[in-house]
């Protein structure tokens, strides 16, 4: 019915306005409504103008699509002609009364289907349902994948490409690691991948100034070291250095009135020459304090060396040796005086004897046929040496003696001349001053070492060499090497060291082979008034800690590897060092600081006497240890 109406309208339009010309009222009769009439009539006039001869061609521009007036006029009532819809976006156009309806294809919207719908931004279908990239296109969209991924058959999801499987040699000698969308050529820590050579190259961290003081680079890593000999230790960050701090202050007060007899490891501490009237006789009075059991207190001789007198200590008792043209004698007697107390000693030449008194009590009388030293030209000339011999005199002695003596003398009076002139000499030289208070033991000041040559090989022992060590320690600083064995090639196959613990106010004891810690005894409070005891034994098969302490050790397999290194070194020559290390590379051991504190060492059943050392730093005290600093109210 509707189409019939349309046909009628079309016939009327043909008759009224094409075959004849119509005015607006006549057009109204055709359309029977105002909106269509209002829409039609202006356009109708344009058609007329276009197709009447002689009009400007400019007027035809809007009617170019039509060949004649009929076509132009017939098209006016059709709202869909010319097409008002966006050609790309419409699916159909429906004509209406002075209106049209564009039906859009999927992906388009708007009255004329002129707007593309952005499916990628659709809140009901996030990212258009794409797992990675959503690409919006006019009227549509499609999903795509990032580099290193491939699209799955559902055209929405992406799957990672395993580049390492696709190209096995992608990374050369490095390890190929597949990562989402890519791959990485991985190197072990301390190495960096070189793209050109396709290999892992060592990172030289030392060139990057990683360490505060000393740095040793090695394949895959680096280690920082601090100059322990200058009093530094590695900080907890394992990079910076900090001063090794005092953990137990000692009373290092000295007095110039007290003459220290062990100022030199080898050599005389004081030399005096007397020229007195010939009636003079030898005499020496002094107070003496020591814990040492053997050594020279004083040695006196005539100018021509023909006569001499030795006052010494042996087994803790006073010994006198003398020799002149008349006689040659040796006498030891009296009580043991190496008790750390001040003992008054006097040696006096009488007419027919030499009298030795301790605390004014006669302990020895040595007969002599004539004067001890022969006067010449009316003068008695005598040379007196404290704590040593002026030259090699071992062959001249009646009984050899180790001259080294760690002790002090005070209130001396030689040849009845008092102390005149001597105190002034001593006053100026700090290292000749004795500590006011001392205890039994050996003191390592943190500035030097003692060297021993010990034979660790035991022929009767099936294990070959063995090291049985007992340490009694009272450290003053929490870091330092206590005992070390050093090979001729400057390696340190065995060391026992102290290190400040990560736990506050405690120390660890570390036992190392070269630069590997094999045992760590953890968190001990060693910096105390009490001495600590450590006992262990080592042979090529085992390291056994006899002191019941908590230890952290490496695996049995690794321990055997390290003991094999030690075994190899023990088959060669090793020197034993106490209190630190000689000049070895910093990287030779985990610790290189000198030990500071008191320490007694027993190796294979023998108590090591620092007076018997091959060499010893002058500041190491063989038989005296400063007492712990006691805070007074004033201090």
């Amino acid at each position: 019915a509707n189409s019939m109406l349309e046909e009628t309208k079309q016939g009327n339009l043909e008759r009224e306005c094409i075959e004849e010309l119509c005015n607006k009222e006549e057009a109204r009769e055709v359309f029977e409504n105002d909106p269509e009439t209002d829409y039609f009539y202006p356009k109708y006039l344009v058609c007329l103008r276009s197709f009447q001869s002689g009009l400007f061609t400019a007027a035809r521009q809007s009617t170019d699509a039509y060949p004649d007036l009929r076509s132009c006029v017939n098209a006016i009532p059709d709202q869909c002609s010319p097409l008002p819809c966006n050609e790309d976006g419409y699916m159909s156009c429906k004509d209406g009364k002075a209106s049209f309806t564009c039906t859009c294809k999927p992906g388009w919207q708007g009255e004329k289907c002129e707007f593309d719908i952005n499916e990628c931004k659709d809140p009901s279908n996030i990212n258009g349902g794409c797992s990675q990239i959503c690409d919006n296109t006019p009227g549509s969209y499609h999903c795509s994948c990032k580099s290193g991924f491939v699209m799955l058959s559902n055209k929405k999801d992406c799957k990672d490409v395993d580049e390492c499987s696709l190209k096995p040699n992608m990374c050369g000698t490095a390890v190929c690691k597949n990562i989402p969308g890519d791959f990485e050529c991985e190197c072990p820590e301390g190495y960096r991948y070189n793209l050109k050579s396709k290999s892992c190259e060592d990172v030289d961290e030392c060139s990057e100034n990683m360490c505060a003081q000393l740095c040793v680079n090695y394949p895959g890593g680096y280690t920082c070291y601090c100059d322990g000999k200058k009093g530094f230790k590695l900080a907890q960050d394992q990079k910076s250095c900090e001063a090794v701090s005092v953990c137990l202050p000692l009373n290092l007060d000295t007095k110039y009135e007290l003459l220290y007899l062990a100022e030199q490891f080898a050599g005389v501490v004081l030399y005096l020459k007397f020229r007195l009237p010939e009636i003079s006789r030898f005499s020496a009075e002094f107070d003496f304090r020591t814990y040492d059991s053997q050594g020279v207190i004083l040695y006196a001789e005539s100018i021509d060396h023909s006569a001499w007198l030795l006052i010494a200590l042996r087994g803790g008792k006073i010994e006198v040796q003398l020799k002149n043209e008349h006689t040659s004698k040796i006498t030891t007697g009296g009580d043991i005086i190496n008790n750390g107390l001040w003992n008054m000693v006097s040696v006096e030449e009488l007419e027919h004897s030499i009298s030795i008194k301790i605390a004014k009590e006669a302990v020895m009388d040595i007969n002599k046929p004539g004067p001890l030293f022969k006067p010449e030209n009316g003068l008695l000339e005598t040379k007196v040496y404290f704590a040593g011999f002026p030259r090699k005199v071992e062959s001249e002695l009646i009984k050899p003696i180790n001259p080294r003596l760690d002790g002090c003398i005070r209130s001396w009076n030689l040849m009845k001349q008092g102390a005149s002139g001597i105190k002034e000499i001593i006053q100026e030289k700090q290292n000749k001053h004795c500590l006011v208070t001392v205890e039994k033991g050996s003191y390592y000041p943190g500035s030097g070492i003692a060297e021993f040559h010990i034979d660790y090989n035991n022929g009767s022992n099936a294990e070959g060499w063995h090291i049985n060590v007992t340490l009694n320690i009272r450290p003053s600083m929490g870091t330092g090497v206590m005992l070390a064995l050093v090979s001729s090639n400057n390696t340190v196959p065995f060391a026992v060291s102290l290190v400040d613990s990560t736990s506050e106010k405690s120390q660890d004891i570390v036992i190392s082979v070269e630069n590997t810690v094999i045992y760590r005894i953890q968190a001990l409070s060693l910096c105390s008034n009490q001495r600590s005891h450590l006992e262990f034994r080592v042979n090529r098969n085992n390291l056994e800690l006899l002191t019941p302490l908590k230890i952290e050790t490496i695996s049995q397999e690794e321990l055997q590897t390290q003991l094999a290194i030690l075994d190899k070194a023990m088959k060669g020559k090793v020197a034993t060092y106490l209190g630190g290390l000689p000049d070895v590379p910093f990287s030779a051991t985990p610790v290189n600081a000198f030990y500071n504190g008191c320490m007694e060492v027993n190796i294979n059943g023998v108590e090591l006497d620092l007076d018997e050392a091959i060499s010893k730093h002058n500041d190491i005290r063989a038989h005296s240890c400063p007492s712990v600093w006691k805070k007074t109210k004033n201090s």
Partner: antibody
Framework: EVQLLESGGGLVQPGGSLRLSCAAS????????MSWVRQAPGKGLEWVSA????????YYADSVKGLFTISRDNSKNTLYLQMNSLRAEDTAVYYC???????????????WGQGTLVTVST | EIVMTQSPATLSVFPGERATLSCRAS??????LAWHQQKLGQAPRLLLY???TRATGIPARFSGSGSGTEFTLAISSLQSEDFAVYYC?????????FGGGTKVGIK
Amino acid sequence: EVQLLESGGGLVQPGGSLRLSCAASRFSFSSYAMSWVRQAPGKGLEWVSAISDSGSNTYYADSVKGLFTISRDNSKNTLYLQMNSLRAEDTAVYYCAKNYESGGYYTFFDYWGQGTLVTVST
Amino acid sequence: EIVMTQSPATLSVFPGERATLSCRASQSVRSNLAWHQQKLGQAPRLLLYGASTRATGIPARFSGSGSGTEFTLAISSLQSEDFAVYYCQQYNSWPFTFGGGTKVGIK
């Protein structure tokens, strides 16, 4: 008051095995080293084995080295002694004992369990 | 190993009297020595440690002395509950060792 309770003792044939347990309570078990001490009938005390607080270090008397294994489970507050290749001379009352000190030193025993009897006989 | 020797093996004492027990070490154990008391059919009980320090709850009549290799346990006035076996134990070095014990009996 600290409590230590041993169990697992009994009669076993020579060459056999036995596992002793010691349940600890009323103290911080994981902070203390522990030991096993034995006492043969009518005889004195003999220390057998010790273990550090974390269990990482163990110590044995020469007489049981390689035959006995000491272990602990800190989550269960329990000490163990695995005894293999038992001999007649291993017959004894086995006591578990607590180390006096926590921290660095192994020391004397301040608390003892009541003991469990192990008899090795045919 | 360190051998601990106790003497006498048996000590008979009247109640109220003083008892002195001795313990000797084959080498120095410094002050690392403990004394334990064991009554018949019971577990040992700690008496003293550090050679001379009384354990918690131990009466003052028990005292210890010595260091190095020679040690003494003294019971000033024996009570009936003190009749037991007493063991010394060194904890200076592995292996820990006990003395053979001293049996204190009623006279």
